[in-house]
């Protein structure tokens, strides 16, 4: 695959140019119909590249993809903040990108795990993203499309904050969830997920090594490394907000 | 849609460097992702480099990455690509293309343009 160098701040008389898009819902709104890399520009943010996935529900913002463990996803806050990985393979957007997108609107959040077998599953929730004052707390704002999400995602109205093994945010007062586990991601108690997790080709005998994977634990559990994960956001309109 | 020009192309022998142009026409530029792809005699058509709307991000094929670099004025409604340390395996017709979404698989275009020739002596 093509290279792809990092993105500069272009220097250009913006009064003559079109605006970009601003994120992948309002790509879908102006006709456009297939998935993809394009290149958006949220508002106060420079223009990046983000994944674009079309549905029928729309357009969505792939913010997270996992399948093969080409990528070291144990790094610290800087490297979620800004963002990491191959925009045609595995990556992690980056909290900023993803702030900038939503703003202050409410969002849906889907995620979509597979097992070793071929299972899949498809999660949906109402989110709302906070800035990094508040460490990207992910505050669930509507229950949860599905069976699987009680106990996974704090209950509606509570916020959990990112953490990093070298920025502990995690509910927990006795352990640094990101340390003991491995990756970023909005720990809880340590044990309910966590989709930026070690990746495991083969299931390790022991379970200590086992815990640092990939897992849903209300889908195959607490100790099953899954195989493939995708996290996509879609901005709500702003009147959908509460 | 966009219109597109190649212009630049030449004989140039090893070692030196030539500056390719793309002009568009029609609105929007800035809005467009922009690709330069190669076709040698016998060989199936390849990607070079790409840029993105803004110029804010850059994409080079393996073989080309260090000696070639892409660029675009968004007012002038034109792309670049500055081609240097030119070898006789860089001698191709030369393509532009745009499109919305970042493509770097000729494949996935339809319709192509008459190109400019490059051609380098050894």
């Known amino acids: 695959l093509p290279e792809m160098a990092q993105p500069v701040d272009p220097a250009h008389n913006v009064s003559r140019l079109h605006r970009l898009p601003r994120d992948c819902q309002e790509l879908f709104q102006v006709g456009e119909r297939q998935s993809g890399l394009f290149e958006i520009q949220p508002q106060g943010s420079p223009p990046f590249l983000v994944n674009c996935k079309m549905t029928s529900d729309g357009g969505w913002t792939v913010i997270q993809r996992r399948h093969d463990g080409s990528v070291d996803f144990n790094r610290p806050w800087e490297a979620y903040k800004a963002g990491f990985g191959d925009p045609h393979g595995e990556f992690w957007l980056g909290l900023e990108k993803v702030h900038s997108i939503t703003g202050d609107r409410n969002s849906r959040l889907a995620v979509q795990l597979r097992d070793w077998d071929g299972n899949a599953e498809l999660l949906q929730f109402s989110v709302h993203l906070g800035g990094e004052d508040t460490a990207y707390s992910l505050q669930l704002t509507a229950p949860v499309a599905g069976q699987l999400g009680a106990t996974t995602v704090p209950p509606s109205g509570l916020s959990v904050p990112f953490s990093t093994w070298d920025q502990d945010h995690d509910l927990r007062r006795d352990k640094n969830c990101a340390k003991s586990l491995s990756g970023g991601w909005w720990f809880g108690t340590c044990s309910h997920s966590n989709l930026n997790g070690q990746y495991f080709r083969s299931i390790p005998q022991q379970r200590q090594k086992l815990k640092k994977g990939i897992f849903w634990k209300t889908w195959r559990g607490r100790y099953y490394p899954l195989q493939a994960t995708t996290m996509l956001i879609q901005p709500m309109a702003a009147e959908a907000a509460s | 849609e966009v219109q597109l020009v190649e212009s630049g192309g030449g004989l140039v022998q090893t070692g030196g460097s030539l500056r390719l142009s793309c002009a568009a026409s029609?609105?929007?530029?800035?809005?467009?992702?922009m690709g330069w792809f190669r076709q040698a005699p016998g060989r199936e058509r390849e990607f070079v480099a790409g840029i993105s709307g803004s110029g804010g991000s850059t994409f080079y094929g393996d073989s080309v990455k260090g000696r070639f670099t892409i660029s675009r004025d968004n007012l002038k409604n034109t792309m670049y690509l500055q081609m240097n340390s030119l070898k006789p395996e860089d001698t191709a017709v030369y393509y532009c293309q745009s499109s919305r979404r970042i493509i770097t698989n000729p494949r996935e275009y339809g319709y192509w343009g008459q190109g400019t020739q490059v051609t380098v002596s050894s």
């Open positions: 029609g609105r929007s530029f800035n809005l467009y992702y």
